[in-house]
């Protein structure tokens, strides 16, 4: 039951964190124009990975694509790339995790495939998640960068007396929604990576060994295996120590084609 | 067609008040930020307010700043100016003027004005 | 405040003939967000309020007649009225929409000589 509840919520968080991924990326205000300690402008600005946008004091906005590839920052590529990573990855990751939850019966799935599905997943969520962040954390650094330089030099001479305000910009809500987004995605694929420890069957240390009576159909089984008969259909083998509570279908084994001789 | 209409105009004594009234018409007016320009007699033009759509922010010319007050009524379609502690130097022709949208904040529609005369 | 410098005071030129009229910015109005200029040009008749002619420096607001042309970037502008008509005798004054408070040039007065 835990290992259910904590493969759900790695699930549902990671979801969350890739659609929070997904938002960040698209969002138009990575920077936003620094209002603090300037002029009071007539226009706001902002900029995203994929356009910037004014906003002007009468409410009309206008945005404008970059439609250069060529011609942008390397860091800015570089954010851009680690995002859509991210985003590729996290949706993998989530098309892997469908199909490893517990409460959603594909075929005769076994324990094992889904736990490393579970695991496979979770691993997708914790790099996913780790883009995520890495791609914000470059452009907040860019940011800071740009920051002090331009405020180093806010007015720029321009022969004589006339000045232009160079404008300075600051964190945009998008670089947060990417932060929480990418640690809600690291934490969904760890949780996911826990709940891979608890879908894996234990292996014992010897292997079970069914002996057949000429005249009787009776299996018997060393160690903590209770003899079965094998009449009819009933050739399932149940574990009695578990070391942990576990429900009957979890713990069932099927017979493979050593399990007699 | 875009109407705007000042009142509330006239002659005030010095240190006195005033509350200058801008109807407007023809245009959703919740939806546009306003202005208030002044000229004073043969003079050029001078900027004093503006009051966004949703009555913020606000902007003041600074020598102005606590002695007038701009503030609106979208259900009325009104624009108001509140002058108090009023000066010579306050003669002009008060404008209301609209913030035009996708126009680069220039002011596309102007009243016809009203003459505010500041004299003892 | 941005300071906005107009020249000349005042202009006398011929019927049919160009007049050209400067406005100075203290500080660029071209706001890098959208390489745009934030200059707007208005058009006062005696006795009437001022009329937008031309904003972001270069665009003609509808309606205006196409003689009117604005050009110039950053901190200077010109307003050139191609082929001066008996209408267009009016002060002609430039102002900044990038900055507040928004602030007017002083002016110049177009005539007809």
């Known amino acids: 039951m835990a290992v259910t509840a904590c493969q759900g919520l790695g699930f549902v968080v990671s979801l969350i964190g890739i659609a929070g991924i997904i938002a960040a990326t698209c969002m138009d205000q990575w920077s936003t124009q620094d209002l603090y300690n300037n002029p009071v402008t007539a226009v706001f600005n902002y900029q995203g990975l994929w356009r910037s946008c004014v906003r002007e004091s009468s409410g009309f906005t206008e945005c404008r694509g970059y439609f250069t590839l060529l011609g942008l920052p390397a860091m800015l590529q570089a954010v851009r790339a680690l995002m859509i990573v991210g985003i590729v990855l996290g949706a993998i990751g989530l098309l892997v995790s469908i199909f490893a939850l517990k409460c959603i019966r594909i075929g005769s799935m076994e324990d094992s495939a889904k736990a490393n599905m579970t695991l496979t997943s979770g691993i997708m969520f914790i790099v996913s998640g780790l883009c995520a962040i890495a791609g914000v954390s470059v452009f907040a650094n860019m940011l800071v960068t740009n920051f002090w330089m331009s405020t180093a030099n806010m007015y720029t001479g321009m022969g004589g007396m006339v000045q232009t305000v160079q404008t300075r910009y600051t964190f945009g809500a998008a670089l947060f929604v990417g932060w929480v987004a990418g640690g809600l995605t690291l934490i969904g694929g760890v949780m996911m990576c826990i709940a891979c420890r608890g879908l894996a069957p234990e292996e014992t240390n010897y292997k079970a060994v069914s002996y057949h009576a000429s005249g009787h159909s009776v299996a018997y089984k060393p160690g903590g295996f209770k003899a079965s008969t094998g009449f009819g259909s009933n050739t399932k083998n149940k574990k009695i120590y578990d070391g942990g509570a576990r429900t009957e279908d979890e713990v069932q084994s099927y017979p493979s084609k050593h399990d007699y001789v | 067609e875009v109407q705007l209409v000042e009142s509330g105009g006239g002659l005030v004594q010095p240190g006195g008040s005033l509350r200058l009234s801008c109807a407007a018409s023809?245009?959703?007016?919740?939806?546009?930020?306003m202005h208030w320009v002044r000229q004073a007699p043969g003079k050029g033009l001078e900027w004093v307010a503006y009051?966004?759509?949703?009555?913020?922010?606000?902007y003041y010319v600074d020598k102005l700043k606590g002695r007038f007050t701009v503030s609106r009524d979208n259900a009325k379609n009104s624009l108001y100016l509140q002058m108090n502690s009023l000066r010579a130097e306050d003669t002009a022709v008060y404008y209301c003027?609209?913030?035009?949208?996708?126009?680069?904040?220039?002011?596309?529609?102007w009243g016809q004005g009203t003459l505010v005369t500041v004299s003892s | 405040d941005i300071v906005m410098t107009q020249s000349p005071d005042s202009l006398a030129v011929s019927l049919g003939e160009r007049a050209t009229i400067n406005c100075k910015s203290s500080q660029s109005l071209l706001n890098v967000g959208n390489q745009k200029n934030y200059l707007a040009w208005y058009q006062q008749k005696p006795g009437q309020p001022p009329k937008l002619l031309i904003y972001g420096a270069s665009t003609r607001e509808s309606g205006v007649p196409d003689r009117f042309i604005g050009s110039g970037s950053g901190t200077d502008f010109t307003l050139t009225i191609s082929s001066l008509q008996a209408e267009d005798v009016a002060v002609y004054f430039c102002?900044?929409?990038?900055?507040?408070?928004?602030?007017f040039g002083g002016g110049t007065k177009v005539e007809i000589k």
């Open positions: 023809g245009f959703t007016f919740s939806s546009f930020g």
């Open positions: 102002q900044n929409d990038l900055f507040y408070p928004l602030t």
């Open positions: 009051i966004s759509s949703g009555s913020s922010p606000i």
């Open positions: 003027a609209r913030a035009g949208y996708a126009v680069r904040n220039a002011l596309d529609y």
